[in-house]
């Protein structure tokens, strides 16, 4: 069966939107009005992995682009990147682990934990216009909570 996907945007708990920053990075900043069109639309695919009531494995592709968020070691540190894939083969139910995030719902907020690197989360900074990254701390000054907005196909 084909993998189930939905289109959405994400905002961090400070209401910062995510936009492209160069070809292979995302950044977070406050957008208003027409600028909202800059925010990236994700194709969130529901993939194979460990699942529970509040934890669902997903892959986060950029809609109509052959780019997926992935988690890899760079200089011995878990790092978030946008990775190019062959669009003929993606998305798929059994995604490689680096593409998989555990979508965790807590108090109407979402966290995205790397399946490859447990306890590492998609994170933004308090500051404006700074990169989205993989952070190893929760509850500190880096932001790991997001809300999801559905986008019609």
């Amino acid at each position: 069966a084909p993998v189930r996907s939905l289109n959405c945007t994400l905002r961090d708990s400070q209401q910062k939107s995510l936009v492209m920053s160069g070809p292979y990075e995302l950044k977070a900043l406050h957008l208003q009005g027409q600028d909202m069109e800059q925010q990236v639309v994700f194709s969130m695919s529901f993939v194979q992995g460990e699942e529970s009531n509040d934890k669902i494995p997903v892959a986060l592709g950029l809609k109509e682009k052959n780019l997926y968020l992935s988690c890899v070691l760079k200089d011995d540190k878990p790092t978030l990147q946008l990775e190019s894939v062959d669009p003929k083969n993606y998305p798929k139910k059994k995604m490689e682990k680096r593409f998989v995030f555990n979508k965790i719902e807590i108090n109407n907020k979402l966290e995205f934990e790397s399946a490859q690197f447990p306890n590492w989360y998609i994170s933004t900074s308090q500051a404006e216009n700074m990169p989205v990254f993989l952070g190893g701390t929760k509850g500190g000054q880096d932001i790991t909570d997001f809300t999801m907005q559905f986008v019609s196909s």
Epitope: S21, S125, G135, Q141
Partner: antibody, heavy 118, light 107 residues
């Protein structure tokens, strides 16, 4: 008053190492992104590296990637730049700078000179 | 990487002149542009950020304008202390990049 004071520069042989420090005062250091920017003698400005307030996010210029490491100690209000495998082209005045709104450098230190020569 | 090209690389002007420095980005950088002033032997000083916002304490004779890829720093009525080198910098994406600089000399 915001103050940034770099130290640790000097003369080093090619292939050698240095660690630069930047002591910050006059603002809440732990809340700000910080940059290192360098300027070769008689040349323009080159961005080197950035670190987030928590230290969780770092980025580097391609010219220093794999050789330089940025870090910070918020308890000491100090920013660091560990420079390994130094080359002649790394010779420059190194400035630390506080990051202002959206990614500008709103306050700069006075700089410390690094000379790589045999 | 985004390339920033400044022109002219140097200019001679007189006190009281109106001066325009141009900065071009190799791609759209939205409003994420800053301008700096540097005098010999000193660290750069932020003049303008977010394209048009004057940094606190900077005289109002400095102004920034432009959009997308083409940007301008204007100095109305040059003062003796304005003879310096000026740099633009994009903050749209990493690696951050600076223009090559414009040296403003006394005619």
């Amino acid at each position: 008053e915001v103050q940034l004071l770099e130290s640790g520069g000097g003369l080093v042989q090619p292939g050698g190492s240095l660690r630069l420090s930047c002591a910050a005062s006059g603002f809440t250091f732990s809340k700000y992104f910080m940059f290192w920017v360098r300027q070769a003698p008689g040349k323009g400005l080159e961005w080197v590296s950035v670190i987030s307030p928590s230290g969780g996010m770092t980025r580097y210029a391609d010219s220093v990637k794999g050789r330089f490491t940025i870090s910070r100690d918020n308890s000491k209000n100090t920013l660091y730049l560990q420079m390994n495998s130094l080359r002649a082209e790394d010779t420059a005045v190194y400035y630390c700078a506080r990051v202002g709104y959206g990614g500008n450098s709103d306050y700069w230190g006075q700089g410390t000179l690094v000379t790589v020569s045999s | 990487d985004i390339q920033m090209t400044q022109s002219p690389s140097s200019v001679s002007a007189s006190v009281g002149d109106r001066l325009t420095i141009i900065c071009r980005a190799s791609q759209d950088i939205n409003r994420w542009l800053a301008w700096y002033q540097q005098t010999p032997g000193n660290a750069p000083k932020l003049l303008i950020h977010s394209l048009t916002s004057l940094q606190s304490g900077v005289p109002s004779r400095f102004s920034g304008s432009g959009s997308g890829t083409d940007f301008t720093l204007t100095i109305n009525s040059l003062q003796p202390e304005d003879f310096a080198t000026y740099y633009c910098q994009q903050a749209d994406s990493f690696p951050l990049t600076f223009g090559g600089g414009t040296k403003v000399e006394i005619k």
